[in-house]
Interface confidence: low
């Protein structure tokens, strides 16, 4: 992460792209830097890693060269910002992005003094864009939650930034482990709690089912069973999405009834593919699989309008299939197809034929 | 009101391209399924292709499945069909319609192709 | 692929006549059929969606019934306004198939 002195906009491009910016005065053209004890203004040109930032959980504003986060001190509200440990409860942590604006507790936002010092201040208005940008929003970037897969909290959203081996990560890491997973711990200190989980890795795609994925020999498919998981159905998507898969989708009886062994010992109901998001479009797999095999429960209401649009699967009933709301939190299977370079590594050349 | 404004139509010989366009207003176009639908002088509505709402699930008629992309541009409202390598049956009225059963339809445009 | 079918291909009736009109799918589709009218030189109108539901603004003559493989569209009382071609479309897969369409004019 060492950042040149220059500032590229090839290279502000990258970091952006992690949702990682440089915080400009749209007014002033300055940008806020994090010194020792204070944040100040500086020539935006002089780039270095105290001038990035990134929004992290719980609505902190993280700083990458500083490793810590904005903070509003109650006791002297007026005086200068500064940075504190992410997880403080001395001071105020949480910021709001509103129309260019960054607001915290009780009306303060960021202004700027007349020594070219940030402070928080109920007086004015002062708006903040994204350096190289063309005048970009800053809220553009906002945290999005990312939920664990694995390890042992069920799903939970990864904290960011959270504390290993004395060093603040504001994303996924691999350090510590000999499999080279991407993992992030789920509170912030991860060697006082030990809460963590593996993150979706958009590069697993290229290896494979990794130990978190399991293959069905038959099929070149590889599943993960998201068995302890809560999420909603677009928090499900999302999280096989971003490991290369889709929600889980069942062509046939074969499948199902892999699904169903695999299931055998969980009285548990899951999120599948099958969704009608569309509410004109009919039940449609995510993955864009045509819909020729089905398994309704009985007392599913198949009104195109119906309120639940979204599809489950229930293990432990021969008639599996049920329809739930969206919003609802429930376990989840990702599937993914490997591409035949991958038959060829897992398989040693032999190739099957899909279902 | 809804409304499904289609251009891009026009005559081509056989074995060209050309593409239309259909632009949506009245509704939040990127929670729709929209359809390529045509029809031939005097006969009845064939049903050409679909993309879901965000674009990722497509698909096709035989007749013109390998020879006709749709796309959408939720930003822009807007739905596309690429037509390659156009016969003379391909010579239809062709209507970008919204949703499942679809209450909808663009102003149609007529794709004539001939030599 | 599910194939749509509808009789009869054409009819004449009177004024006032009570009109059936069929379709058949080659495989069972719940009911996710929608009925269509089409006057010459129009667009596609929806009259009826989900086998059985009016679409809003619809008169209430129209009506829809069936559920799987056979359904039947009915106008209880034939008016001279609803001269037109009437066609079947089955959404509940891809390829959303129409049927060859019923042409009703009035005797």
């Known amino acids: 992460e060492g950042v040149a002195a220059a500032l590229t906009p090839e290279r502000l491009l990258e970091w952006q792209d992690k949702g990682i910016f440089v915080i400009q005065s749209e007014s002033l053209k300055k940008c806020i830097q994090a010194g020792k004890s204070v944040l100040t203004l500086e020539n935006c040109k002089q780039a270095n890693k105290h001038m990035l930032w990134k929004w992290v959980s719980n609505h902190g504003l993280f700083n990458i060269g500083g490793s810590g986060c904005l903070g509003l001190n109650f006791s002297a509200p007026e005086q200068p910002l500064s940075l504190y440990e992410c997880d403080s409860t001395l001071v105020s942590l949480r910021w709001r992005c509103n129309r260019k604006m960054i607001t915290g507790p009780l009306q303060y936002s960021v202004q700027v003094a007349h020594d070219n010092t940030v402070v928080a201040s109920r007086k004015y208005i002062h708006k903040w864009i994204s350096y190289g940008s063309g005048g970009g929003d800053i809220c553009e970037y906002l945290h999005k939650d990312l939920h664990t897969i694995k390890g042992n909290t069920h799903g939970m959203p990864c904290m960011f930034p959270f504390q290993y081996n004395h060093q603040w990560h504001h994303e996924c890491t691999r350090e510590g482990r000999e499999d080279d997973l991407l993992w992030c711990a789920t509170t912030s200190r991860y060697e006082r709690d030990e809460k963590w989980g593996f993150c979706p890795d958009p590069t697993s795609a290229e290896v494979g089912c990794d130990t978190i994925w399991e293959k069905d020999l038959n099929s070149h498919i590889c599943y993960q069973f998201n068995l302890l998981s809560s999420l909603s159905w677009s928090e499900a998507h999302s999280s096989c999405q971003m490991q290369g898969g889709t929600l889980l989708s069942i062509t046939d009886e074969t499948e199902e009834n892999f699904i169903r062994e695999h299931m055998s010992s969980k009285t548990v109901e899951v999120w599948m593919g099958l969704n009608q998001l569309d509410e004109h479009a009919g039940w449609q797999w995510s993955d864009g699989t045509p819909l020729n095999y089905l398994n309704w429960s009985p007392e599913v209401n198949f009104e195109p309008f119906v309120e639940d649009h979204c599809g489950t699967f229930s293990s432990f009933m021969p008639s599996a299939w049920r329809s739930r709301d969206c919003e609802s939190t429930l376990p989840y299977i990702c599937k993914k197809y490997l591409n035949h370079i991958d038959h060829e590594i897992v398989e040693g050349g032999h190739h099957h034929h899909h279902h | 009101q809804v409304q499904l404004v289609q251009s891009g139509g026009g005559v081509v010989q056989p074995g060209n391209s050309l593409r239309l366009s259909c632009v949506a207003s009245?509704?939040?176009?990127?929670?729709?399924?929209i359809h390529w639908v045509r029809q031939a002088p005097g006969k009845g509505l064939e049903w050409v292709a679909v993309?879901?709402?965000?674009?990722?699930?497509?698909y096709y008629a035989d007749s013109v499945k390998g020879r006709f992309t749709i796309s959408r541009d939720n930003s822009k409202n807007t739905l596309y069909l690429q037509m390659n390598s156009l016969r003379a049956e391909d010579t239809a009225v062709y209507y970008c319609?919204?949703?499942?059963?679809?209450?909808?339809w663009g102003q149609g445009t007529l794709v004539t192709v001939s030599s | 692929d599910i194939q749509m079918t509808q009789s009869p291909s054409s009819l004449s009736a009177s004024v006032g006549d009570r009109v059936t009109i069929t379709c058949r799918a080659s495989?069972?589709?719940?009911?996710?059929l929608a009925w269509y009218q089409q006057k010459p030189g129009k667009v596609p109108r929806l009259l009826i969606f989900a086998a059985s539901t009016l679409q809003s603004g619809v008169p209430s003559r129209f009506s829809g019934s069936g559920s799987g493989t056979d359904f039947t569209l009915t106008i209880s009382s034939l008016q001279p306004e609803d001269v037109a071609t009437y066609y079947c479309?089955?959404?509940?897969?891809?390829?959303?198939?129409f049927g060859p369409g019923t042409k009703v004019d009035i005797k």
């Open positions: 479309q089955k959404y509940y897969s891809a390829p959303f198939t």
């Open positions: 993309i879901s709402y965000d674009g990722s699930n497509k």
């Open positions: 009245g509704f939040t176009f990127s929670r729709y399924t």
């Open positions: 495989q069972g589709i719940r009911n996710y």
């Open positions: 319609a919204r949703g499942g059963p679809t209450p909808d």
